[in-house]
Structure formats: C-alpha cells, structure tokens
C-alpha cells in the first residue's frame, strides 16, 4: 500500500537498518526510497525538546510486515518509502536549506557570487554530493562568499548542524543539470586499476555500470565476467573512484570490462531498471519466499509485486510436475545485489522491476519499428503529438513531443496569431488524423511558454513548451522521449528520424498518416554554407540529404527530430525552418534541444 503523507510527532519503533543525516523529512523519505531495503523511516526535526545531536537524523528501517509499532514522540516525523508506490520517483532535490551546515569532507573551497553559483559548481564537479555556502552576512569576514564542495561515502551528510548565515544544498546531477560528460562506452578487456570503494555481484557489465551510477561514490567500474580466470572473482563488480575523477591506469586484461558511472546521463538512460533475464544463472541471497510460477516472466512479476523482493531465481518445472509450474525463489540482500552468482544449474534469474519507476519513463524500450517505408505504424513514435487549433476550424497546426506527463515541447513559431491556449487541443497516441473525431479525447492546454528571446524561426530560439491541463497516463502509444544529456554534446547521432503529418511537397496538404523519414545530420559549418543569408548558430542543428528528397515540410513544425543512441531515443531537434522542402543542398533547420535543456528544466520544474 502506498502511503505518501508524513506522520508528525510519530516514531517507528525498531527495524533500524542505518542512520543517515538529512536536512528534511521529505529528503529522508527519498533516501529511504533509494536504499535497497528501507521501507519506513523516522526523522528527527530540530526541536528544543530534542537533543541537538539527534536533530536531522534519518533512521532507515525495514520490517517483514512492512510496518512497525508507532510511538508518540515530539519532533519525530515518520513515513514510508515510495517503493510501495507506483508513481514516478526522482532523487532531484533543488531545495536550499537556510542556516544549516551539512557536514562532509570539504575537498574544495572557492569564492562564489551566490548560493546558486555554488550549487552549479557542485553539480559540475564529479565528486560533489552537496555544498555549504557562507553568505555575505556570515560573521567571519574571510569565510564570506565561500563555497565548500563536499562529499561523503553515502552521498548524505555525516552530520547537520545549525549555523547562522550559511545555506546548504545538494548537487543537481540527479536533476539532469550537470555539464559533465556522459561516457556510455563499456571498454572490453580492460581493468581500471584504482581504489575500490565497494564491490557487488552482477550478472553482466551493464548491471555493474548501473549499480555504479546510483552508488554515491562510484565514478567508474571494472567487471569480471563469468569467464574470468580467477573463479572467486567471477561476476564481481568493482566500484571505483580516483582523485582526478578518471581512471589513472588502464590494464589490458581479457574477460574484464570497464566503464564509467552514468550519473551525468541518468535521466536519459535506465540506471535502476535491470529488466533482462539471465538464463542458466542462479542468484543467491536471503530467501524471502518460494512460490509456484508458470514462467520466469511470471516469477519476475511476483518479485516486482513483493515490495521486499530485490531479485529472483526461477527453476523451470520438471515435465508434468506441479501443473507445469516451476519454483520462483524471491530473494533479497543487504545491498540489493545477489551475494553470489552461480552458472550451469538451470535457473533463470533477474531483478525486480519495482525500481524501474526511479528511471525516467522515456528510457523504456518501445516496440521495434518498421524499417523503410514512409508511413509510420501505431506506437512507433509514442512521444509524437498532433497539436490542433480550433480556429477558424479544427485542424492540425503543428507537431510536438511529450517530454513529461504534463509537458509538450514544440516550436515557438507555431503560435503566431494564437490568441489563447484555450483554443488548442493536443492529441496523443494518434497515427491517422482521420481517427480524430468530435468525441476523441484530447488534452487542453493550460499555458503556452515561448522562449522570451524568440522573434522568428530563422533567428533561433524557436522553442516552446505547452503545459497541459491534465496529466498524460503513459501507455505503449503515448509516452515521453528523453531529452539529450548536456554531457552528450559531442555525441555523433547516426540514426535520426523526422516525423510528422506535414506536407509531402511544398504545395500539398496535411497527411492523414504520420510520416517518417530517416535523415542524416549535417554539420553546422556545412549548413551555414547552404544558408549564406542566415546565421546558423550552435543553438540550431541541421539535417538533410545533399541531393534533397527527404525533409520536414509545412505542418511538421514543432515535431521531433528523434535520434536513437544506445537503444534510447532522444529528442535532438525540433522542426523549425528551411528553404522550401527537401530541396537539393537545403537541409532542414531544427532547434538544437541540448542547448535548451536548462531552459526546459527551469520552466518544467518551476514550483
């Protein structure tokens, strides 16, 4: 059962796993949610009746029954983890805590103009978990405007104390606001020889990389595969760090793989969700339950629905035994990973999918697409929406992309002459315009947010957000697309598609079926040569064939230029402008979304 409200002046008795320090009960709840075993917590707020050494303690708790006895205690705030909830969860914490000093290892001290600048510095520093900033009213003159970057083993403060005229806060890496590079490559036959901060068992290098990503101290990892010569180290995932933030030494070793934490790109790739099945593999751990199940998929479902289950092993039924049902072993451990991984015993293992809700919905795999052909199939581009105006009559106006459950990203130029958001209708999950009838459900638009530097498409800033009146329930036919990571600025996208219901030639009409075209990106230098009369800025991105023939056209505006990278689709561009349509040596010009990630997040995450 999902319980989101906090219980004031209440303490849960027993079940303690560990104690951490958090600046608020709300953040204690987030820490509990992300902890592999925590189901409940008790936080102690500052209070004259409470010993100051206990202020800001966040006691993480577990219970076989998923609840614990409640005791009345002033200043105690208790609650439940969000593990039991189905809603999307984020570790992003933008709060600034006034007059609180969050203690940790102060590894960097510098002058900053503001707390915001200090927070940005922390966000863009690979080691930084949180910061404390002494304001210009701080009593000690030499400490004024000092920004202290801090880290700890757990990612949370080692203590929190009251201190006048300072503010503290957390890194915004988990808010997708870091400019740090996002290195997705996994290097085969490589060992990073740096200090290990932890080690866990993992079935493959991908899971190891994801574990490294959500481990607060891990910057890179080395994984020993099941073919690794030293038996005791097989399937071992070594979580590593270094002072520089990069591996100091790379050693060539067969059957080992290494890679980096995906912290700077975690909003656009799955890091919590280990959805694969591992055949002929047994995961060992503390046994929670043994249940009969028809298949390994059914076993995974059982594990996902059991809140304490972290991973499972399914042993298929012996012929005609137990109505064809096999045994499903639901398991857990102290860190969420198997204590040992065995091969060759016939089991099928995997992880709970309960943690998938901690990943961005946009990272979910969508169904395979039809290659070739220009007409799309249902569910092929589930983030694509058709934006209709009702003036003078109802019609398709522009494309757009779902980027959040209440947000559509589109082009600013679509709203020329649009007097009010009320006259707009957003339809999602649509393949054919003819499906849209008078009684077709739509999303009303609450607000149109146009970039305040927008003047005309050709001069850039052609970007707008639509805030919907109601939230989108994600399904196979309507779900978000990931924004590109700021750390991915140097990625060369090779699998890019433009989609829309727009014209197929300059003098045409809106198409009934959603059209798609695979289009190569063109460098800005090349694009500038083709548009001598315009300034192609770094905030624009171009795509098109030299010979023309495939391009976006009228009616496609605002729609996505979607590029697939590492199995995840990213919204690389927004269809903006071009000279004619599909003309030779006249590429289409798109708004370069990565350059507006900060703007998008500022507008969509505004309180």
């Amino acid at each position: 059962e999902c319980v989101t409200q906090l219980l004031k002046d209440t303490c849960f008795e027993g079940g303690d796993i560990t104690t951490v320090f958090t600046p608020s009960a709300k953040y204690c709840q987030v820490v509990c949610t992300y902890h592999p075993r925590c189901l409940l917590f008790t936080f102690t707020a500052e209070s004259p009746s409470e010993d100051p050494t206990r202020w800001f303690t966040c006691v993480l708790k577990d219970s076989v029954t998923e609840t614990l006895p409640r005791v009345n205690r002033t200043a105690a705030i208790s609650g439940y983890s969000f593990k039991q909830c189905s809603h999307q969860i984020s570790a992003c914490n933008k709060d600034i805590y006034v007059d609180l000093d969050m203690k940790g290892i102060n590894y960097n001290s510098s002058v900053a103009k503001s707390a915001q600048e200090c927070q940005e510095r922390c966000t863009d520093d690979v080691h930084c978990h949180f910061f404390t900033y002494a304001t210009r009213q701080f009593p000690s003159l030499e400490h004024r405007n000092i920004c202290l970057l801090k880290h700890t083993q757990t990612g949370t403060p080692t203590r929190i104390t009251k201190l006048d005229k300072v503010v503290s806060g957390f890194s915004l890496k988990s808010c997708a606001l870091s400019n740090l590079a996002c290195i997705r490559d996994i290097f085969p036959n490589t060992v990073f020889a740096d200090s290990n901060i932890d080690s866990v068992m993992a079935p493959d290098a991908f899971v190891c990389g994801r574990i490294c990503t959500h481990h607060p101290g891990c910057l890179f990892f080395t994984f020993f595969s099941q073919e690794w010569p030293k038996e005791s180290q097989r399937n071992l995932c070594l979580l590593k760090t270094s002072e520089s933030g990069l591996p100091s030494t790379r050693i060539k070793k067969s059957k080992a793989l290494s890679g980096f934490s995906l912290q700077s790109c975690r909003h656009s790739i799955p890091v919590f969700c280990h959805s694969s099945f591992y055949h002929d593999t047994d995961f060992l751990g503390e046994e929670l339950d043994i249940v009969a199940a028809k298949s390994h998929e059914a076993c995974q479902k059982l594990c996902t629905n059991a809140v304490r289950c972290q991973f499972f092993t399914y042993t298929p039924a012996q012929a005609s035994c137990n109505e064809g049902k096999g045994k499903c072993y639901l398991k857990l451990s102290s860190n969420g990973s198997p204590t040992k991984i065995l091969h060759g015993r016939g089991g099928i293992s995997g992880y709970t999918l309960r943690l998938c809700k901690m990943d961005n919905e946009c990272t979910t795999k969508i169904k395979p697409r039809i290659v070739g052909g220009t007409a799309s199939v249902r569910g092929e581009w589930p983030w694509q929406v058709t934006l209709h105006t009702t003036s003078p009559t109802q019609r398709h106006l522009c494309g757009g992309s779902i980027i959040g459950n209440q947000w559509i990203l589109t082009a600013a130029h679509c709203f020329y002459g649009v007097e009010s958001p009320k006259i707009l209708r957003v339809y999602s999950g649509i393949l054919n315009q003819s499906e849209i009838k008078e009684d077709t459900s739509f999303f009303g638009v609450q607000e149109i947010i146009i970039h305040d530097q927008y003047k005309m498409a050709e001069s850039g800033y052609d970007i707008a957000l639509l805030k919907l009146e109601t939230t989108v329930n994600y399904t196979d036919s309507q779900r978000p697309i990931c924004l590109p990571s700021k750390g991915d600025r140097n990625v060369i996208y090779t699998d890019c598609w433009v989609t829309g219901w727009g014209y197929r030639k300059l003098r045409d009409k809106i198409q009934n079926t959603l059209q798609k075209a695979k289009i190569p990106l063109v460098t800005n230098e090349e694009c500038q040569k083709r548009y001598r009369g315009h300034k192609i800025t770094h905030k624009m991105i171009c795509a098109g064939y030299r010979e023309g023939g495939k391009d976006a056209c009228k009616g496609d505006s605002g729609g996505p230029l979607s590029c697939k990278h590492n199995e995840v689709w990213h919204l690389v561009g927004i269809t903006s402008w071009g000279e004619g349509c599909a003309q030779r040596e006249r590429p289409g010009v798109y708004t370069n979304v990565v350059e507006y990630v900060d703007w998008i997040l500022e507008k969509t995450q505004a309180v």
């Epitope: 009702t390 003036s391 109802q394 009010s420 009320k422």
Partner: antibody
C-alpha cells in the same frame, strides 16, 4: 440535442444600437467557437466575427470591427452581438452558428433587425 | 480576403436530373469548404464539410468534391424538396467568406 435559440425581432432607428442574444444548449458552450453571420434580404451570407467563450478570444471581419462587439456569458451559455451606429444597411437577418468540429453545424433561427426612421 | 465565386447564380432543373453547382476560391483553401442548403424563411443547414464529407442525416444524393481552388456540389437525382438556395463557404482563413448563393428551382 444541440440548440441555438436567438432573441426576437428588433426595430431600431438609425444611429441606435442593438444587442442580439443566442442561447446555447445541449453541448459544452465553452468548447466551441460561436460565429455571427448576416444575411440581407435576398442576399448571400456575410461573416461578421466569432468568439471563443472559454477565453473571450474574438475575430472580426474588418467591415464590422469598429461597430460589432461579441461577448459571451458562460454562466448562462449565451452569446451576444452588440451592433452600434445602425444604418439602413444593417437591416438583415442575423444568425448565430456554432463552429463544430469542421464546419458551422448548428444555426440559430435568426433574428430580424430592421433599421428605419 | 478570399473571394468565393459561386456559379450559376440560379438554375432550373427537372426532378431526377443531375445538378452541379461550382464554387471557385480566389486562392488555395485546401479542403476547408462547406456547402449549406437554405430554404425560404429558414436558417442555413450544413450539407457537406471538408469539401467532400456528407454531414450526418444528409441524403446520399448530395456529394461534394474538389480541393485547392475548385469545388463542386452535386445532386445526383434532384428531388422536389431540394428546392432551396445553396451556399458555399471557406473556413481556411479569416475572414470567413461565402459564395453569393445559387438559387435552385424545379422546372
């Protein structure tokens, strides 16, 4: 069922003003544009303007922009057209009509306005 | 403004005849054209929308065609109750405009 019921005939003197009403029922009034159309005796149809009741957004034909004012009262689901500085040229039947999904699908019965001294 | 030119302005035909009325737009209106029927003393009624879609309840002897600038309303077999004035109108852009009407009579 959708119905648009317009106010009764009006006889006005030149220079006067008139306010016509159009009461809507059977649908969500705020969700559709309401248009006003003029038809002089034995003539064709002439568009005056439209209003979106949910936001009070309006559009007018240039010819009527200075004299016609469209308003809507969402609490009573009624649209109004105020026409000022009447002349004999304004003698006509005035229709309110709902812009449905793709076209003007429901029309009021019309209000006859006669301007005569 | 987009001018809608309707022709003929009047026509007389016999019951059972095939009747065609045309409407020409001064510029491209894609398919944002509607046809209305107006009987004496009554308000106009919608027959065709989107150039070729028959509105609910309209007999199938009425059909519309065309796109861009040239549009046609066809009555495949004229009936006595079809005596009326027919109007075309465009809703592609503001201001909305109508043809001057075609008065249809029975011979």
């Amino acid at each position: 069922q959708v119905q648009l019921v317009q106010s009764g005939s009006e006889l006005k003197k030149p220079g006067a003003s008139v306010k016509l009403s159009c009461k809507a029922s059977g649908y969500t009034f705020t969700r559709y544009w309401m248009h006003w159309v003029k038809q002089a005796h034995g003539q064709g149809l002439e568009w005056i303007g439209n209003i979106y009741p949910d936001s009070d957004s309006t559009n007018y034909d240039e010819k009527f922009r200075t004299r016609a004012t469209l308003t809507a009262d969402t609490s009573t689901s009624t649209a109004y057209m105020h026409l000022s500085s009447l002349t004999s040229e304004d003698s006509a039947v005035y229709y309110c009509t709902r812009m449905g999904f793709y076209a003007m699908d429901y029309w009021g019965q019309g209000t006859s306005v006669t301007v005569s001294s | 403004d987009i001018v809608m030119t309707q022709s003929p302005s009047s026509l007389s035909a016999s019951v059972g005849d095939r009747v065609t009325i045309t409407c020409k737009a001064s510029e491209n209106v894609v398919t944002y054209v509607s046809w209305f029927q107006q009987k004496p003393g009554q308000a106009p009624k919608l027959l065709i929308y989107g150039a070729s879609n028959r509105y609910t309840g309209v007999p199938d002897r009425f059909s519309g065609s065309g796109s861009g600038t040239d549009f046609t309303l066809t009555i495949s077999s004229l009936q006595a109750e079809d005596v009326a004035t027919y109007h075309c109108g465009q809703s592609y852009s503001y201001p909305l405009t109508f043809g001057q009407g075609t008065k249809l009579e029975i011979k």
